[in-house]
């Protein structure tokens, strides 16, 4: 298995709050004597090895944080120490983890590092981690909300979409439309009143740039991803083209820098044919994307 | 840098119980391992057990785990190593030596002077 | 518990020349997950505490002179010192941390 982060940096105002996110791919030893931790700690700018030294997090060793999944057990952890601290570590089943940090504070800036280690029965570790910076702002120079920037090691010589493995393209690509499927599909009723107009429905697709093999040799290919609106019929374009095995083109792809939304809170849409032709259009690409991707 | 600092020697009578201390610097103490690893005159390295600062929680190997205690002070970054009911044959240079795991085992990378204890009566 | 046995258990060699210390374990030292040797080589020399010198069967620490060398895998290693230099005569522990932690018995390397 690889650990792939989906941000390198991401820049915050005080006060604000964060959720840093990585994700775990490819083969995972599911057998009854393995059990998994998955953590976060923090580490130094500047060392041979990223990672290689762990200094707590507000406090929280690297114990306090994990997650532990023994077998097919859920993840858990130490809830309500971390949530003392202002944190919170959370995981799901399609190998996301994150850590959620309130209430930042220019001290909580530096080098965070995520952890995934497998252990087998009466063994010791295998292990794989990944790298992140978070910047705390103050002042006039703060950005308003989060603001990630995609991992792009190498965005000067970006090979393109192509070098990232397509099925992490679609694991991406499908928990991405789950989330913004049903998360607009769930809007509450005072979100369709709202007379406003509405604003592009968000899609986290994964970004060009960052679409690049990393220049360790053994570290996995950094597959990351930005908010990004598509327009019009693109998502009927970009579907079609993932339906027949083609990885998008470039112009399908909006490297930005991308506004951390909340999760949990899609964007509103109004009522009227806009938003509805729209959906329909997201519906018409995530359908092609599930189709696609189950064949792989 | 890096650095494991230990207590002085002990002369302890049979029966009695030894008390060494190692101190930490250079480093994140809560976050690494601590062991212990005692040698006998003459021979080669015996694993005791171990401590993660953070949590106080400590592993001994089976041999230890009903006469020795480790404990830890993370407001001095200390660990200490009691062994109680001394024989002569606890006669040895106790070292205290960091390692790097997470969960599972690792090499000792940072190790102490050693603390020579003496049993006899 | 993964037994450790080391040979000879002493070894004379002159200045300059080539030592071969051999370690091996009672069970595989190689974690399947990552194809890695949980396997440590320490110096010690008389009343000093041990010092790392190789870790994952192969990989230096740093600082530590490239005439130290790691090989083996599975059960059997080998840790060559190319050219023996006057401050290299000491004892030398082999380590295995896969399973708990187990030392071998040790081979000194002394002044033929």
């Known amino acids: 298995f690889k650990v792939a982060t989906l941000y390198s940096l991401y820049v915050c105002p005080e006060g604000q709050n964060v959720t840093l996110t990585c994700r775990v791919f490819g083969p995972v030893d599911k057998g009854h004597d393995v059990t998994f931790y998955k953590t976060w700690y923090r580490s130094s700018r500047g060392e041979v090895q990223t990672c290689s030294e762990r200094r707590p997090i507000r406090n929280l060793t690297f114990q306090d944080l994990h997650l532990h999944h023994g077998g097919h057990q859920a993840a858990n952890t130490s809830h309500d120490l971390a949530q003392r601290h202002g944190l919170e570590s959370a995981s799901d089943h399609h190998g996301n983890f994150s850590i959620t940090m309130r209430n930042l504070t220019l001290l909580d800036s530096g080098l965070y590092c995520c952890l995934v280690v497998e252990i087998r029965h009466h063994h010791s570790e295998h292990r794989v981690h990944g790298a992140m910076e978070l910047q705390v702002q103050t002042g006039k120079d703060a950005p308003s909300s989060c603001v990630a920037y995609p991992s792009s090691s190498q965005e000067s010589e970006s090979k393109g979409p192509s070098s990232c493995p397509f099925w992490v393209i679609c694991s991406l690509l499908s928990s991405s439309c789950t989330q913004t499927l049903f998360g607009t599909l769930a809007l509450s009723p005072q979100a369709h009143r709202n007379p406003s107009p509405p604003p592009p429905l968000l899609l986290h697709i994964p970004s060009a740039s960052s679409l690049v093999q990393s220049p360790e040799a053994h570290s996995p290919s950094i597959c990351s991803g930005v908010s990004a609106p598509l327009a019009s019929l693109e998502w009927l374009c970009l579907g079609s083209h993932l339906w027949l095995g083609k990885v998008p083109h470039d112009r399908y792809w909006v490297p930005q820098a991308a506004k951390c939304c909340p999760s949990h809170q899609p964007p509103m849409t109004s009522e009227g044919w806009g938003s509805r032709i729209q959906l329909l259009q997201i519906s018409v690409f995530c359908v092609s994307v599930f189709l696609r991707c189950s064949l792989l | 840098q890096v650095q494991l600092v230990q207590s002085g020697a002990e002369v302890k009578k049979p029966g009695a119980s030894v008390k060494v201390s190692c101190k930490a610097s250079g480093y994140s103490f809560t976050d690494y391992y601590i062991n212990w690893v005692r040698q006998a005159p003459g021979q080669g390295l015996e694993w005791m057990g171990r401590?993660?600062?953070?949590?106080?929680?400590?592993y001994y190997n089976e041999k230890f785990k009903d006469r020795v205690t480790m404990t830890r002070d993370t407001s001095t970054s200390t660990v200490y190593m009691e062994l109680s009911s001394l024989r002569s044959e606890d006669t040895a240079v106790y070292y205290c030596?960091?390692?790097?795991?997470?969960?599972?085992?690792?090499?000792?990378?940072?190790w102490g002077q050693g603390t020579t204890v003496t049993v006899s009566s | 518990e993964i037994v450790m046995t080391q040979s000879p258990a002493t070894l004379s060699v002159s200045p300059g020349e080539r030592a071969t210390l051999s370690c091996k374990s009672s069970q595989s030292v190689l974690y399947s997950s990552n194809q890695k040797n949980y396997l440590a080589w320490y110096q010690q020399k008389p009343g000093q505490a041990p010092r790392l010198l190789i870790y994952?069967?192969?990989t230096r620490e740093s600082g530590i002179p490239a005439r130290f060398s790691g090989s083996g895998s599975g059960t059997e290693f080998t840790l060559t010192i190319s050219s023996l230099q006057s401050e290299d005569f000491a004892v030398y522990y082999c380590h295995q941390y896969l399973s708990s932690y187990t030392f071998g018995g040790g081979t000194k390397v002394e002044i033929k």
């Open positions: 994952w069967a192969s």
């Open positions: 401590i993660f600062p953070g949590s106080g929680n400590a």
């Open positions: 030596a960091r390692d790097d795991s997470f969960y599972g085992y690792w090499y000792f990378d940072v």
